[in-house]
């Protein structure tokens, strides 16, 4: 976060930024950045493993819900969306593409399918589904 | 738009950041960043009067929509929220608070109640309410 | 069991356009679930990942190469090729195709045995 | 992109010791850590996925561990068929890179 004073090394112009106000990123140009988490809503209909390369692509991954209060911009999505959650059958558990496991209490996890990855839907739902459906996707990239 | 490089002059540290990269804003701490305006949602209903006072005390305004493309995020809202658009009973119009007339196109204006004030809905629809009914609302601030 | 065969001239002058194609056999190459890829190691070196395809087309390249690369799918004959233009003897190696099995974040489970390609006039 | 060290570079073993290969990626890449076995003349088999995921038909011999940065791959008590060159590779984000790799030999 870059507050109070900011020196644009291009232009060597001194900005002046309220102590109260920040600079959030960096992002990939036109993402949404909240609490120094970039995310991009893709309207496009792909299946869970291209959802997944396409976000790769764009030097991210798959949404992944880590806090209710850090992402509390996700109570307010409309619709689902492909998250980066997928369900590992050896051991009955639900981890994210970085192989962490879904923290209990996160996610309220809906079977609205068979399947093993899935939906996000607003108010921190998990809809499970084939991962071969298409549907819209959410990637994310995490900002050190 | 911050990109390249920057000194953060606290520090005095050069960091790189990659030219398609960029930083977001300044908002107000923990407000949403996209397209550098900045945008908060408000969990707590109050009347429209209350929420634009709301706002303004954050050196912002209710929401204004004014492009599809540079606020297609609010597409994906879910639920009704105040945004600053009234209606002018002496000429029939709908301004937003700055007093800038609703460009045709950009909302479908829905009769939900008799009502001179409008609820923003996802897809670009905005509901007609009285404005002493009480809901959540967006406040928006636009970076220069 | 699925296996991949890899084929194409063994010998490309410089400056020229190197082309091979991966036969997949004893699987379906329009799975969902899977991701084709190329890999190269150099003579006596390690491994060098070149990019992959899925069956849809999409492509995924490695930014070093990716000027001189393009990887294609043929579903109808169960093949994807590489193509690797105005090479130089630097991409002399042995080139692999490789399958993911479960996304493209899954490891290489399945190889093709590898074709040498030496780059020389 | 990331970049992916193994240690040692090589290793002279004694069969039935226990080796143990490290490999350290410069960025976290939680578990997306893959290792393989190359054996002259022959293309890759993969050993390990995800960091510590067995594979069906591997010796129970091959195990690894880690997440993050950094990983092992352990040879429980070594075999004569077991000299190869063993690489990791991360899967993370693109372009996927492997290590160096590590050459292991028989005493």
């Known amino acids: 976060i870059w507050s109070a004073v900011f020196l644009n090394s291009l232009f060597n112009q001194e900005v002046q930024i309220p102590l109260t106000e920040s600079y959030c990123g960096p992002c990939p140009k036109n993402w949404i950045c909240y609490k120094n988490n970039c995310y991009q809503f893709f309207d496009e209909s792909k299946n869970w493993y291209e959802s997944q390369a396409s976000c790769m692509s764009q030097n991210a991954s798959l949404l992944k819900v880590y806090s209710k209060e850090d992402q509390d911009l996700l109570k307010l999505v409309k619709s689902y969306h492909w998250m980066g959650l997928v369900h590992i059958p050896t051991n009955g558990s639900w981890q994210w593409e970085d192989g962490s496991i879904l923290s209990p209490n996160l996610l309220t996890i809906i079977e609205m399918q068979k399947g093993d990855c899935a939906l996000y839907a607003s108010s921190f739902k998990g809809y499970i589904e084939n991962c071969s459906t298409p549907n819209t996707y959410i990637c994310m990239q995490r900002t050190v | 738009i911050w990109s390249a490089v920057f000194l953060n002059s606290l520090f005095n540290q050069e960091v790189q950041i990659p030219l398609t990269e960029s930083y977001c804003g300044p908002c107000p701490k923990n407000w949403i960043c996209y397209k550098n305006n900045c945008y908060q949602f408000f969990d707590e209903s109050k009347n429209w009067y209350e929420s634009q006072a709301s706002c303004m005390s954050q050196n912002a305004s209710l929401l204004k929509v004014y492009s599809k493309e540079d606020q297609d995020l609010l597409k994906l809202v879910k639920s009704y929220h105040w945004m600053g658009l009234v209606h002018i009973p002496t000429n029939g119009s709908w301004q937003w608070e700055d007093g800038s007339i609703l460009s045709p196109n950009l909302l479908t204006i829905i009769e939900m109640q008799k009502g001179d004030c409008a609820l923003y809905a996802s897809s670009f629809k905005g509901y007609i309410e009285n404005c002493s009914t009480p809901n959540t609302y967006i406040c928006m601030q636009r970076t220069v | 069991q699925v296996q991949l065969l890899e084929s194409g001239p063994g010998l490309v002058k410089p400056a020229e356009t190197l082309s091979l194609t991966c036969t997949v056999s004893?699987?379906?190459?329009?799975?969902?679930?899977?991701?084709w890829d190329w890999i190269r190691q150099p003579p006596g070196k390690g491994l060098e990942w070149i990019g992959s395809?899925?069956?849809?087309?999409?492509?995924y390249y490695d930014s070093s190469l990716k000027t001189r690369v393009t990887i294609s799918v043929d579903t109808s004959k169960y093949q994807f090729s590489l193509r690797l233009s105005s090479v130089t003897a630097a991409d002399t190696a042995v080139y692999y195709c490789?399958?993911?099995?479960?996304?493209?974040?899954?490891?290489?489970?399945?190889w093709g045995q590898g074709t040498l390609v030496t780059v020389s006039s | 992109e990331i970049v992916m060290t193994q240690s040692p570079d090589f290793q002279s073993v004694t069969p039935k010791e226990k080796v143990t290969i490290t490999c350290r990626a410069s960025q976290s890449i939680g578990n997306n850590l893959h290792w393989y076995q190359q054996k002259p003349d022959q293309s890759p088999k993969l050993l390990i996925k995800?960091?510590?995921q067995s594979i069906s038909g591997v010796p129970s011999r091959f195990s690894g561990s880690g997440f993050g940065t950094d990983f092992t791959l352990t040879i429980n008590s070594l075999e004569a068929e077991d000299a190869a060159a063993y690489y990791c590779?991360?899967?993370?984000?693109?372009?996927?890179?492997f290590g160096p790799g590590t050459k292991v030999e028989i005493k």
């Open positions: 004893g699987g379906s190459i329009t799975s969902t679930s899977y991701f």
């Open positions: 995800y960091a510590s």
């Open positions: 490789a399958r993911h099995e479960f996304g493209i974040r899954d490891a290489f489970d399945i």
């Open positions: 395809i899925y069956h849809s087309g999409s492509t």
């Open positions: 590779h991360q899967s993370n984000s693109f372009p996927f890179t």
